[in-house]
Interface confidence: low
């Protein structure tokens, strides 16, 4: 059992109060983390509470302001970036969000040597992406889908690409589907380690079908938003990778990097680029049918000024039981010899582990092993490899940081975090300085989050960076719910669950149960992290039991569980939620006449299918921005797990797994369907089709749309949404207002 340390006990119980919905909507109990912005082995930058940019030197203990809040305020800057030679800072303002990661902004360059903004050859606006070279102060930026280079901030720009066109050709930035489903970044350009070369992707969306939706705004006529968006089976972007010498950019111009022949024989994706040295680069490619990935190491040919990718440097990663990788194919971390690398992929037992690849993948040396999974490689130094895993005490929802000594033989393993603050901290991430001289640990729970600074050689804690004291004090008089993480063993499947229980929970009483589900492939909901959110309020104030269950298809418990849903989305995820509910009823404290389920996005799909399962278990449920048919969702994501919606592939299951096909089954449940009309991700079309099917089947249901809101339903919509859902659930559970 994991009981979250909820508070420092106050002897005067009558001063304790339950959480309110207002607490949640106001973010009263939000926490802070501290991630140093490392600029060397022993120095980092941090934006202080009063908005000064401060440089800290760990070894001297000194700190000084490099940029005042007055300078920041003069251009309304919300972000900054120091050039590696420490001569200039870019200041970012006029932030304008586009999709999940992308945004445009105005950039000003501030010269630290003379305390003035750089005048002449100013940057155009708005810029889609801007970054310094890793050495010196060269600038690369993307404007109107084309890439530009400046040797110095005050110099005129050199235009690298000329074919950029809105919604057609994207240079140095991803199109919608690559941003959301493949790169998970706003950029698609990469400097070589010393800034000699700049690699970039070109995405050609000319032939991609366009999703169009109305944006109502305030005008007499709504605007139409058009996004090239490949749905399952549709034409995909065509990607090409180029590299340009930034020292003499006009000399030979951008050189295209060849695609491995076995990849190029059919539709494919580019998945990531990793520079190894200034003259060696590693590209990862993926077949459209995403069970084969190729890692290709390419070398610069000085004589031809081209990039050569010999077949002997192609490493194939293939899955015979599912798709390649976890959510994404893992990226390599190269060792100091600049050819061998460390990478996480499935071992022979079907668990994701770190492997060392020297020559071929077949001859890979397995570095970690066990019935748990390595999750992230943080840093490889000459003598150590730092990684995270969920090995400790066999809880898949934990994350601890480990160090493996690779300089000695046999390599020894040490858990850096397991015993630091064992009750408070079981879910960590880390951030390392150059050469791992120092690192920050950020603990997300289950107790109140805390960020600490450590010596990279001895692992000694140097200081606390952020301990959320104000939050701790604010929670002292709050009746937080209890949380427990346990597992159910059902038919050789382990179902981990998190149960959130009312503060005065009594096993002899009956409580309404709300299942919160996500359930998407390679996701994990049952995690040992701190949160005070809507479901905390529902348990604390409204006396509900809330449960989260990780069923088949979820991550970090081996390929058997993960790949169980391959080509069959919408089947086992739903079955496992239902199985868990039956087990919860058997525990004796659930009122089986008051059970609900809710989910957002993939969770909205699962909750809809669970409600329409015909089991009679659920009284009501909510689907927020659900997928309703996999034919409506993005190709890259959908086909990874479902194959293609073609007759000779998997069309039959595409058709069988829709929410619409089960419209009749909603007759005996109360269903609340919610969607934003400007959802660029899971299109409003999904809910429109559910509503149409329910109307055609003459099934009553409730619905709410949020005009001009995207997949996140942010701002005032958030308040309205949670208030609306609260009323719905309280009505369903016959709880008084």
């Amino acid at each position: 059992i994991v009981l979250r340390p909820s508070r420092v006990h106050n002897s005067e119980e009558n001063t304790m109060r339950a959480l309110t919905l207002k607490d949640i909507l106001n973010g009263t109990f939000s926490y802070k983390t501290f991630f140093p912005n490392w600029i060397s082995g022993q120095e980092y930058l941090h934006q202080s509470a009063d908005n000064n940019i401060v440089l800290y030197n760990i070894e001297t203990g000194q700190s000084y302001t490099i940029l005042s809040n007055r300078t920041m305020k003069s251009v309304n800057a919300s972000n900054y970036g120091l050039s590696p030679d420490r001569q200039f800072v870019y200041l970012e303002s006029d932030y304008s969000k586009l999709w999940r990661y992308s945004y445009t902004a105005t950039y000003y360059i501030y010269d630290l040597s003379n305390g003035e903004f750089v005048r002449g050859n100013e940057l155009p606006r708005p810029i889609q992406y801007l970054c310094w070279s890793p050495v010196g102060s060269k600038l690369a930026y993307v404007y109107q889908n084309n890439i530009y280079l400046k040797q110095r901030p005050g110099d005129p720009p050199f235009q690298i690409t000329f074919n950029g066109r809105e919604n057609k050709i994207f240079n140095g930035i991803p199109d919608w589907v690559y941003e959301e489903e493949m790169l998970a970044t706003k950029y698609a350009l990469w400097w070589s380690p010393n800034g000699k070369f700049l690699a970039y992707a070109e995405f050609n969306d000319t032939d991609i079908p366009v999703i169009a939706y109305s944006y109502y705004g305030d005008e007499q006529y709504p605007r139409t938003i058009n996004i090239p968006y490949p749905k399952a089976g549709a034409k995909n972007p065509v990607v090409r990778i180029f590299i340009i010498d930034t020292t003499y950019p006009a000399y030979v111009g951008p050189q295209e990097v060849p695609v491995p022949a076995m990849i190029a024989s059919s539709d494919y994706y580019f998945s990531w680029l990793t520079w190894v040295t200034d003259e060696r680069v590693c590209l990862q490619w993926l077949k459209r049918v995403q069970n084969v990935s190729v890692l290709s190491i390419c070398d610069f040919r000085e004589d031809w000024q081209t990039w050569d990718c010999p077949k002997t440097q192609e490493h194939i990663e293939e899955s015979r039981t599912g798709w390649a990788g976890g959510f994404f194919v893992s990226t390599p971390v190269f060792s100091y010899d600049a050819i061998s690398y460390y990478k996480i992929f499935s071992d022979k037992d079907g668990y994701k582990h770190i492997h060392y690849i020297k020559d071929t993948v077949e001859n890979a040396i397995q570095i970690t092993s066990g019935k748990w999974e390595a999750i992230n490689i943080f840093r490889v130094t000459q003598d150590s490899l730092f990684y995270s895993s969920n090995e400790f005490e066999e809880y898949p929802g934990r994350r601890n940081i480990y160090r493996i000594s690779i300089g000695s033989y046999p390599p020894s393993k040490k858990c850096v975090t397991c015993h630091l603050r064992k009750e408070r901290c079981q879910y960590y991430t880390a951030s390392f300085s150059d050469y791992a001289k120092y690192y920050a640990l950020v603990c997300y729970g289950p107790g109140i989050p805390i960020s600490t600074l450590h010596d990279g050689r001895t692992d000694q804690e140097i200081k606390i960076l952020e301990e959320n004291k104000e939050l701790e004090n604010a929670l002292k008089n709050i009746q937080l719910p209890k949380e427990e993480i346990k597992k159910l063993e059902v038919d050789e499947i382990t179902l981990w669950y998190k149960m959130i229980l009312p503060p005065q929970f009594d096993r002899s009483k009956k409580y309404p149960l709300l299942i919160q589900v996500y359930g998407g492939p390679c996701s994990q909901s049952v995690r040992s992290v701190f949160a005070v959110n809507w479901i905390s309020y529902l348990a604390s104030k409204e006396g509900m039991v809330i449960a989260l269950v990780d069923g088949r298809g979820t991550a970090f418990q081996g390929d058997k569980l993960l790949y169980a849903v391959y080509r069959k989305l919408g089947v086992y995820e739903v079955e496992d939620q239902i199985t868990a509910v039956r087990k919860f009823i058997e525990m004796g404290f659930i009122d089986e006449k008051r059970i609900a389920i809710w989910g957002w996005s993939y969770g909205g799909y699962v909750s809809s299918l669970a409600l329409a399962s015909g089991t009679g278990l659920f009284k009501c449920g909510i689907a927020v921005a659900p997928v309703s048919s996999w034919e409506y969702y993005a190709s890259v994501y959908t086909e990874r797990f479902m194959g293609l919606p073609t007759k000779d592939d998997n069309l039959e299951h595409y058709k069988n797994s829709t929410v619409m096909a089960r419209a009749e089954y909603f007759r005996n449940v109360d269903y609340l369907l919610i969607h934003g009309t400007a959802d660029d991700n899971v299109h409003f079309q999904n809910s429109a089709q559910i509503a149409k099917a329910l109307v055609n089947a003459q099934v009553d249901f409730q619905a709410m749309w949020y005009s001009d809101q995207n997949h996140g339903l942010s701002g005032l919509s958030t308040n309205h949404l949670y208030t609306h859902m609260t009323h719905f659930l309280k009505q369903c559970f016959s709880l008084s207002d």
Epitope: V238, R240, A264, S265, S266, K647, D648
Partner: antibody
Framework: EVQLVESGGGLVEPGGSLRLSCAAS????????MNWVRQAPGKGLEWVGR??????????DYAAPVRGRFSISRDDSKNTLFLEMNSLKTEDTAIYYC???????????????WGQGTLVTVSS | SYELTQPPSVSVSPGQTARITCSGD??????AYWYQQKPGQAPVLVIY???QRPSGIPERFSGSSSGTTVTLTISGVQAEDEADYYC???????????FGGGTKLTVL
């Protein structure tokens, strides 16, 4: 230089069998999806079937008129593609071509090659 | 079953522009390829992925795509362009390969 050379065609009676071969050279055969296409006298091109690479599962797909009667296989060590034809019908009379289309880097030309074809005549 | 529909014949005078269409319900999802076949010869690829031209194919050959129709355009037709032209749907993402019925281009 890429070459595809079909052989094994000839005259066969209805209900009979025939095995066609296609010898490939000049490219990495094991990386290519290989197809058979036929053309009846005076008619259009008709796809017969294809075999994927080993890395793509080595699976075969067939056009409806030949499914269950024809079988495609490959021998990557010998760079050879085969078409086993059983229960032949008069309407199977055609020139049979093997062909490969590999789209390489989008700035380059596709590798697209056909053999010269081999004539199969099914007649009593 | 899925079909690609082409006009049986198109006639055009030398120097004029010939347009050969090919329609099919799946063409919004699948690329089209165009082959030229002269009597007694194997087909030759003239357009791939709807609009790309292989090296060695004259610039007068171009391709376009709109909805369920793809079009092969030959501008400034020459006598040597007289041939049969076949469209083929892409097979790169596991659908079956399908050829259109072919269009005989006659240069008057």
């Amino acid at each position: 230089e890429v070459q595809l050379v079909e052989s094994g065609g000839g005259l066969v009676e209805p209900g009979g069998s025939l095995r066609l071969s296609c010898a490939a050279s000049g490219f990495t055969f094991s990386d290519a999806w290989m197809n058979w296409v036929r053309q009846a006298p005076g008619k259009g091109l008709e796809w017969v079937g294809r075999i994927k690479t080993k890395s793509d599962g080595g699976t075969t797909d067939y056009a409806a008129p030949v499914r269950g009667r024809f079988s495609i296989s490959r021998d990557d060590s010998k760079n050879t593609l085969f078409l086993e034809m059983n229960s032949l019908k008069t309407e199977d009379t055609a020139i049979y071509y093997c062909f490969i289309t590999v789209i390489v880097v989008s700035s380059e030309s596709p590798l697209d090659h056909w053999g010269q074809g081999t004539l199969v005549t099914v007649s009593s | 079953s899925y079909e690609l529909t082409q006009p049986p014949s198109v006639s055009v005078s030398p120097g004029q522009t010939a347009r050969i269409t090919c329609s099919g319900d799946e063409l919004p999802k699948q690329y089209a390829y165009w082959y030229q076949q002269k009597p007694g010869q194997a087909p030759v690829l003239v357009i791939y992925k709807d609009r790309q031209r292989p090296s060695g194919i004259p610039e007068r050959f171009s391709g376009s795509s709109s909805g369920t129709t793809v079009t092969l355009t030959i501008s400034g037709v020459q006598a040597e362009d007289e041939a049969d032209y076949y469209c083929q749907s892409a097979y790169s993402i596991n659908t079956y390969v399908i050829f259109g019925g072919g269009t005989k281009l006659t240069v008057l």
